[in-house]
Amino acid sequence: EQAPGTAPCSRGSSWSADLDKCMDCASCRARPHSDACLGCAAAPPAPFRL
């Protein structure tokens, strides 16, 4: 997991300043408002569990 300004996160993940780590874009289905999701694909998340 990289610090901001170094190599980007691996494919399918995006940097979260809140958590200070790369986060899986898959998590945006559950947490679409996460700061990491700003860097993920623009497709809208599928409806989540509830």
């Epitope: 899986d24 898959a26 509830l50």
Partner: antibody, heavy 119, light 111 residues
């Protein structure tokens, strides 16, 4: 270094109550959803309850088998969370683990604590 | 609730060979992009440890001998080559909806 330190558990009589605690360190506790997962030879690994983060309005969810009996809560200021268990029955016996999840998978786990419900 | 069925219940594999564990969900746990299936390893007296997230993404620090695949309802965990230290019980778990449910486990023994 991430740690989830559990306390509570032990022997309790049927119909009794018990409170489990979990203190977290080494990660951004307030941003994570927290769960309790239990394990028994009869039922294997079983998710019990979840409490989400402040940004998710501290929403809580429970397994059907514990709804109305168990209450999950958290204290972000002290990086700890709890499971209050009431009206315990023999089928609640097992090892209880606290665990953190950002969204989907159980990332960090406590060491586990034994609960035995027996007269 | 989504029922997770793991096979086999137990497995004995020779050192250096391949171990294959299957997990079937009672309904799809995948979108067009991601599968909400995860794998854990548990050794006696220890909590489960995350190995694979989202069906095929290796958790940080987990050896590349572990790999996951599948989508929809059918998923597989492969370990190759197996090592002595891989003796454990392996579980799948979905996060498609609440309640999250786990498979019944596969106990791996190394011959």
């Amino acid at each position: 270094q991430v740690q989830l330190q559990q306390s509570g558990g032990g022997l309790v009589q049927p119909g009794g109550s018990m409170k489990l605690s979990c203190i977290a360190s080494g990660f951004t506790f307030s941003s994570y959803w927290m769960s309790w997962v239990r394990q028994s030879p009869e039922k294997g690994l079983e998710w019990v309850a979840e409490i989400r983060s402040k940004s998710d309005n501290y929403a809580t969810h429970y397994a059907e088998s514990v709804k109305g009996k168990f209450t999950i809560s958290r204290d972000d200021s002290k990086s700890r969370f709890f499971l209050q268990m009431n009206n315990l029955r023999a089928e609640d016996t097992g090892i209880y683990y606290c665990s953190s999840t950002y969204a989907d998978y159980f990332h960090y786990w406590g060491q586990g604590t034994d609960l035995t419900v027996s007269s | 609730d989504i029922v997770m069925t793991q096979t086999p219940a137990s497995l004995a594999v020779s050192l250096g060979q391949r171990a294959t564990i299957s997990c079937r969900a009672s309904q799809s746990v995948s979108t067009s992009t991601y599968s909400y299936m995860h794998w854990y390893q548990q050794k006696p007296g220890q909590p489960p440890k995350l190995l694979i997230k989202y069906a095929s993404s290796l958790e940080s620090g987990v050896p590349a001998r572990f790999s996951g695949s599948g989508s929809g309802t059918d998923f597989t965990l492969n370990i190759h080559p197996v090592e002595e230290d891989d003796t454990a019980t392996y579980y799948c778990q979905h996060s498609w909806e609440i309640p999250y449910t786990f498979g019944g486990g596969t106990k791996l023994e190394i011959k």
